[in-house]
């Protein structure tokens, strides 16, 4: 009858599971690119924007060669959980200026949640620990102004784009090593 409900199915092919995660990540990367471009068209950004509550970028030029699958999946999952919180916050507190992007932000949130579920499944199939975030969760207060929420949206989408680009690189390389 198969494994009991709720217990992970042991995968016969971790490459196929990882492949599926890569494709979902690329799909989310495409959505993020598109939404970031829409943001730039509607609300041109004056330079780079940052947000203290966002995770620091996980990568540097030298790190790809030494990546290990457990570390990549754990870090990616933790970072994506943070970005999910930020997207939820944007939808809730972004104000009228971001309301026009609500359908796209909603779709992005749904895809982020789907990728997180896939990563969780992959980690359980590979018997990796489901690590909790090692950083304290910073409460997200309301943006100081309409322009503040626009700057925050630029920062969130820009950071998510880089995180996903790094993730695709790392996962593609790891897949060739499996």
């Amino acid at each position: 009858p198969g494994p009991p409900a709720g217990s992970p199915r042991v995968s016969s092919d971790p490459r196929a599971d990882l492949d599926s995660a890569v494709l979902l990540t690329r799909s989310l990367l495409a959505d993020t690119r598109q939404l970031a471009a829409q943001m730039r068209d509607k609300f041109p950004a004056d330079g780079d924007h940052s947000l203290d509550s966002l995770p620091t970028l996980a990568m540097s030029a030298g790190t790809l060669g030494s990546l290990q699958l457990p570390g990549v999946l754990t870090r990616l999952r933790v970072d994506l959980m943070s970005y999910l919180r930020h997207v939820q916050w944007l939808r809730r507190a972004g104000g009228p200026s971001l309301k026009t992007l609500e359908p796209e932000l909603g779709a992005l949130q749904a895809r982020l949640e789907r990728l997180l579920r896939r990563l969780q499944l992959l980690m359980s199939r590979l018997a990796l620990p489901q690590a909790a975030p090692d950083q304290p969760v910073i409460p997200l207060g309301p943006p100081a102004s309409a322009w503040g929420s626009i700057r925050a949206a630029h920062a969130i989408l820009g950071g998510l784009h880089l995180t996903l680009d790094w993730a695709v690189r790392g996962l593609l390389l790891l897949k060739t090593r499996l």
Epitope: D19, L23, L24, R26, S27, L29, A30, R33, L57, M59, S60, A61, G62, T63, L64, L162, D165, W166, V168, R169, L172, L173, K175, T176
Partner: antibody, heavy 119, light 111 residues
Framework: EVQLVQSGAEVKKPGASVKISCKAS????????MDWVKQAPGQRLEWIGD????????IYNQKFTGRATLTVDKSASTAYMELSSLRSEDTAVYYC????????????WGQGTTVTVSS | DIVLTQSPASLALSPGERATLSCRAS??????????IHWYQQKPGQAPRLLIY???NLESGVPARFSGSGSGTDFTLTISSLEEEDFATYYC?????????FGQGTKLEIK
């Protein structure tokens, strides 16, 4: 106008290295990755690797790992490809091309740099 | 690596005729709602030019006589009515996996 302009033709001896530049203009350099493609006479196009201008972190075709090195100079909107330990079969036209990892097609190409390896 | 095989290797047609170029992948390149196949045109002494991306999307500035179709392992580039400037070599490329690879090309010649 979106453009990628590459450095000029090179003639090198076997065992030497070559470094090709690719200057981007007409778009925000950090918004796209830069890919490199080889076209040897009578051979199919061959992808060499890809680099993200913001984070570096190049990925390579295993065939070129260890011999190709991709770098960027963000301030100059310029990407570089260095190929070391040159041999005769490296004689080819090398292209830089604008890409991204989501769909990974190349929508803007440089004019190509001819590298000839001959003793 | 995924191998792309293009056919025919060369094709001689006249202006005004319809051209059908094929690209077959050694494994499926369609998944998660995308078909990761792209088509390029290359003329002698020039860089490749993107025509079609993701199997069927026409790149900006490319004439509407070019179209792409297919899914899974079999893909087609169609030129509905050939113009003089269409005689060139055409390449397909996949981006399903690392590394992306190209087909060997189809040379379209004037009859």
């Amino acid at each position: 106008e979106v453009q990628l302009v590459q450095s000029g033709a090179e003639v090198k001896k076997p065992g030497a290295s070559v470094k090709i530049s690719c200057k981007a203009s007409g778009y925000i350099f950090r918004d796209y990755n830069m890919d490199w493609v080889k076209q040897a006479p009578g051979q199919r196009l061959e992808w060499i690797g890809d680099i993200n201008p913001t984070i570096g972190a190049p990925i390579y075709n295993q065939k070129f790992t260890g011999r190709a090195t991709l770098t960027v100079d963000k301030s100059a909107s310029t990407a570089y490809m260095e190929l070391s330990s040159l041999r005769s079969e490296d004689t080819a036209v090398y292209y830089c091309a604008r890409g991204e990892l989501a769909h990974w097609y190349f929508d803007v190409w440089g004019q190509g740099t001819t590298v000839t390896v001959s003793s | 690596d995924i191998v792309l095989t293009q056919s025919p290797a060369s094709l001689a047609l006249s202006p005004g005729e319809r051209a059908t170029l094929s690209c077959r992948a050694s494994k499926s390149v369609s998944t998660e709602g995308y078909s990761y196949i792209h088509w390029y045109q290359q003329k002698p002494g020039q860089a490749p030019r993107l025509l079609i991306y993701l199997a069927s999307n026409l790149e900006s500035g490319v004439p509407a006589r070019f179209s792409g179709s297919g899914s899974g392992t079999d893909f087609t580039l169609t030129i509905s009515s050939l113009e003089e400037e269409d005689f060139a070599t055409y390449y397909c490329q996949h981006s399903r996996d690392l590394p992306p690879t190209f087909g060997q090309g189809t040379k379209l010649e004037i009859k």
